[in-house]
Interface confidence: low
């Protein structure tokens, strides 16, 4: 069967296409090419008589067509109007006709696109930006690239106008990137130059560094302020509410206690119209801003109730500090048996009672800092049992209970035997 193959099928403007004939019959008289899907004398391009090898142009001949002896037709310098169907009409020697139709499509060679923007300096969380890929080209596909990667999926990104327009809603600083558009059709693909999206933002809340609050007299105070901002923020400093200077750094040499106060950094972005402040308290003092952890020393940690006394000492190398004592989360002293001395350094318990058993710790502090010791455990034992708890029956001692002694009975069998011997000795 007679067929026509277009090579290529999609043709770029200005290029050429070959309408290649397959299965051409033998014993031909001649053939003709027509523009369109049917034989129409008014749309004949060219005719060819084999016997005379004569080619005759028809009404649709443009001067760009060449016919070959094998009936194939070459069309050069293709124009948009050439798109469509072409019909070959073959006349055999027996005057029986045969027809075949082929087609091709013509596309423009795409120009390099460019990006137009409706907002060259959008403000973060406020503005939208619409990029449009120019020019508008029929039958072209539009693609977008961000930092040379395909568009991320985001509810803030919207494609419209046949993907020719990319809109970013509520832009953020992270949208600051390189944007390109690409146009494609079956015969070409072109990419634009980058457009850099410049999102204006900030200032964010400023950070004052270093983070120190306490300084010694005579030190140099050097504070730096930074706030993320585009364009960069302009900074100013206030001390106790009074303007000092318009710089990013504040330097005060040889400070005194009079330099204590509130230090405010003010960051301003004149383009976004926003400003932010951070306040930092500076304290100039001889006192140590870090109190070392104190240690407790005990005269003994296991004592006999109603008999022994104990001294607990809170040791610290810091000066200008105060000391307080705690027992089972209660502040001491809590009874007349407890005495504090040497500026609360020493806690004396005399005599020790059963209820004094437990954990003790001390805390050292000054007006700006404090620290606690590790706890120390005080154990209280009873070596002698009170008389009223013992009954003498046939020289045997029996425990009668009462006064909570039952609690320590099992733990104090040795002391019990010692008490028996002690009791016998006195009777």
């Amino acid at each position: 069967k007679l067929t026509i193959e277009s090579t290529p099928f999609n043709v770029a403007e200005g290029k050429e296409v070959l309408l290649l004939v397959h299965n051409l019959p033998q014993h031909l008289f001649g053939y003709s090419w027509y523009k369109g899907e049917r034989v129409d004398g008014n749309r004949q391009i060219i005719g060819y008589v084999i016997g005379t090898q004569q080619a005759t142009p028809g009404p649709a001949y443009s001067g760009r067509e060449i016919i070959y002896p094998n009936a194939s037709l070459l069309i050069q310098n293709i124009i948009q109007n050439d798109t469509g169907f072409y019909t070959l009409h073959v006349i055999k020697s027996d005057l029986v006709n045969e027809e075949a139709t082929g087609q091709f499509r013509v596309y423009p060679e795409l120009p390099k696109p460019s990006i137009s923007s409706n907002n060259s300096k959008p403000v973060e969380d406020k503005d939208a930006v619409a990029f449009t890929c120019e020019p508008e080209t029929q039958d072209a596909t539009y693609l977008w690239w961000v930092n040379n990667q395909s568009l991320p999926v985001s509810p803030r990104l919207q494609l419209s106008n046949g993907n020719r327009t990319l809109t970013l809603f509520n832009v953020t600083r992270n949208d600051s990137a390189s944007y390109k558009c690409e146009t494609q059709n079956p015969v070409s693909a072109r990419r634009s130059d980058s457009v850099i999206l410049n999102v204006l933002y900030g200032p964010d809340t400023p950070t004052i560094s270093p983070s120190d609050t306490y300084y010694r007299p005579g030190a140099n105070l050097s504070l730096s302020c930074y706030a993320a901002s585009n364009p960069p923020a302009q900074y100013s400093w206030l001390i106790n509410g009074t303007f000092q200077q318009s710089t990013q750094e504040l330097f005060i040499p040889n400070i005194t206690v009079n330099n204590s106060g509130s230090y405010t950094c003010h960051a301003n972005n004149s383009v976004t119209g926003c400003n932010r402040t951070t306040v930092k308290t500076i304290i100039v003092t001889e006192l140590s801003p870090v109190v070392a952890k104190p240690q407790i020393k005990a005269s003994k940690t296991t004592v006999t109730g109603d008999k022994d006394s104990v001294n607990l000492t809170c040791s610290t190398n810091d000066t200008g500090i105060s000391i307080r004592w705690f027992f089972k989360n209660q502040s001491l002293p809590s009874s007349e048996r407890m005495k504090l001395s040497q500026g609360n350094i020493t806690l004396s318990i005399n005599p020790v009672k059963r209820e004094d058993a437990g954990t003790y710790w001390c805390e050292v502090f000054n007006p700006i800092s404090k620290n606690q010791s590790d706890p120390i455990m005080l154990n209280v034992n009873y070596n002698a049992l009170p008389q009223e708890n013992l009954i003498n029956v046939d020289e045997q001692l029996y425990f009668q209970g009462g006064s909570g002694l039952n609690d320590i009975f099992e733990a104090q069998k040795i002391e019990w035997h010692e008490a028996r011997a002690h009791h016998h000795h006195h009777h």
């Epitope: 060259s120 300096k121 930092n147 040379n148 600051s176 990137a177 390189s178 130059d193 980058s194 850099i196 410049n198 585009n230």
Partner: nanobody
Framework: EVQLVESGGGLVQPGGSLRLSCAAS????????IGWVRRAPGKEEELVAS????????RYADSVKGRFTISADTSKNTAYLQMNSLRAEDTAVYYC???????????WGQGTTVTVSS
Amino acid sequence: EVQLVESGGGLVQPGGSLRLSCAASGFNIKDTCIGWVRRAPGKEEELVASICQYSGYTRYADSVKGRFTISADTSKNTAYLQMNSLRAEDTAVYYCAITSHHGDYNYWGQGTTVTVSS
């Protein structure tokens, strides 16, 4: 994310030289124009120099012509500003910026301080 990071600022005596660097990320400097903007207290902001790598176009402010040279290394994605014969009036914070042929500038770095003082 587009970022510009400047370096190379410092204290220099009048007549001395400095070379500022601007390392770009998030885009290709060959696709656009890069410039240096300076900001000094009490003075107008000034675009001192810019270079458009794709066209080879450079421009300089009159105040720095013949003293400053802008260049770019596309393989390092970095722009440079060579500053010679520095004067006290060149003292400023210098920002790297993305610019245009027309001298507009928008996307800024965070700046590097140049102090010219004896």
